[in-house]
């Protein structure tokens, strides 16, 4: 889980070691602050849980791409 050290900066100290189906993911945000020990991606799930993930992992990149496309596609 992400950790807010001094709000509003949120950092990740550990990454999930499991791939998560993209259909469980609702959105993401990138963590690039120099105040954090490592770059990270925080996924928010469909039940509003937050998960720290490693942006270097392929499944993380694929999930971000999928969520980007989902956001761009207007619902009819």
């Amino acid at each position: 889980q992400p950790d807010a050290i001094n709000a509003p900066v949120t950092c990740c100290y550990n990454f999930t070691n499991r791939k998560i189906s993209v259909q469980r993911l609702a959105s993401y945000r990138r963590i690039t602050s120099s105040k954090c020990p490592k770059e990270a991606v925080i996924f928010k799930t469909i039940v509003a849980k937050e998960i720290c993930a490693d942006p270097k992992q392929k499944w993380v990149q694929d999930s971000m791409d999928h969520l980007d496309k989902q956001t761009q596609t207007p619902k009819t």
Epitope: Q1, N17, R18, K19, S21, Q23, V47, I51
Partner: antibody, heavy 120, light 113 residues
Framework: QVQLVQSGAEVKKPGASVKVSCKVS????????MHWVRQAPGKGLEWMGG????????INAQKFQGRVTMTEDTSTDTGYMELSSLRSEDTAVYYC?????????????WGQGTLVTVSS | DIVMTQSPDFLAVSLGERPTINCKSS????????????LVWYQQKPGQPPKLLLY???TRESGVPDRFSGSGSGTDFTLTISSLQAEDVAVYYC?????????FGQGTKVEIK
Amino acid sequence: QVQLVQSGAEVKKPGASVKVSCKVSGYTLTELSMHWVRQAPGKGLEWMGGFDPEDGETINAQKFQGRVTMTEDTSTDTGYMELSSLRSEDTAVYYCATDPGGYSGYFDHWGQGTLVTVSS
Amino acid sequence: DIVMTQSPDFLAVSLGERPTINCKSSQSVFYSSNNKNYLVWYQQKPGQPPKLLLYWASTRESGVPDRFSGSGSGTDFTLTISSLQAEDVAVYYCQQYYSSPWTFGQGTKVEIK
């Protein structure tokens, strides 16, 4: 193709513990999330718990809290489910199950089942 | 926890007929952002583990005959077998995977009349 092979049937006395194993082949354990589901004789399916990346840990159904321990040995790709303080109502077939190659919440591969009989 | 309720508990149907099994969830398992229902159906034959039939309420798992179909959204779902075959005798379970703990319906036993 994922394959799950479980340990053999067990007969236990009330109050004892049982540990069931589930060996994964075709994938590594860290590519999957292993869960445990039980089925009492003539009854329905009951999810006991499993690894939940949304919580970053193994989670258990409320009714098993404090009695069940689920562990993983990633060096051998084997999952374990230990149930303690056994009672006659724990007599059931215990299944391990995994999701379709990414934590999903449903199960496309199942072990063959392990019958645990609790009897004095 | 989301409670899943199936009806009926038992169904006796003639070969070639069209059984339908209902599954109701105590709260919606539909997620509007991706337009998906987080519900699966399993088939379990005696002495065997469950077999995944349908996911996302209506998507057939690979290798599942097209006589099996699923419909519904939100809280009310249906599994239909368009023409019952002898090998379809089994217990059928729905399960929600919207939020943990994952919960199953109590099962519907389908037999031949």
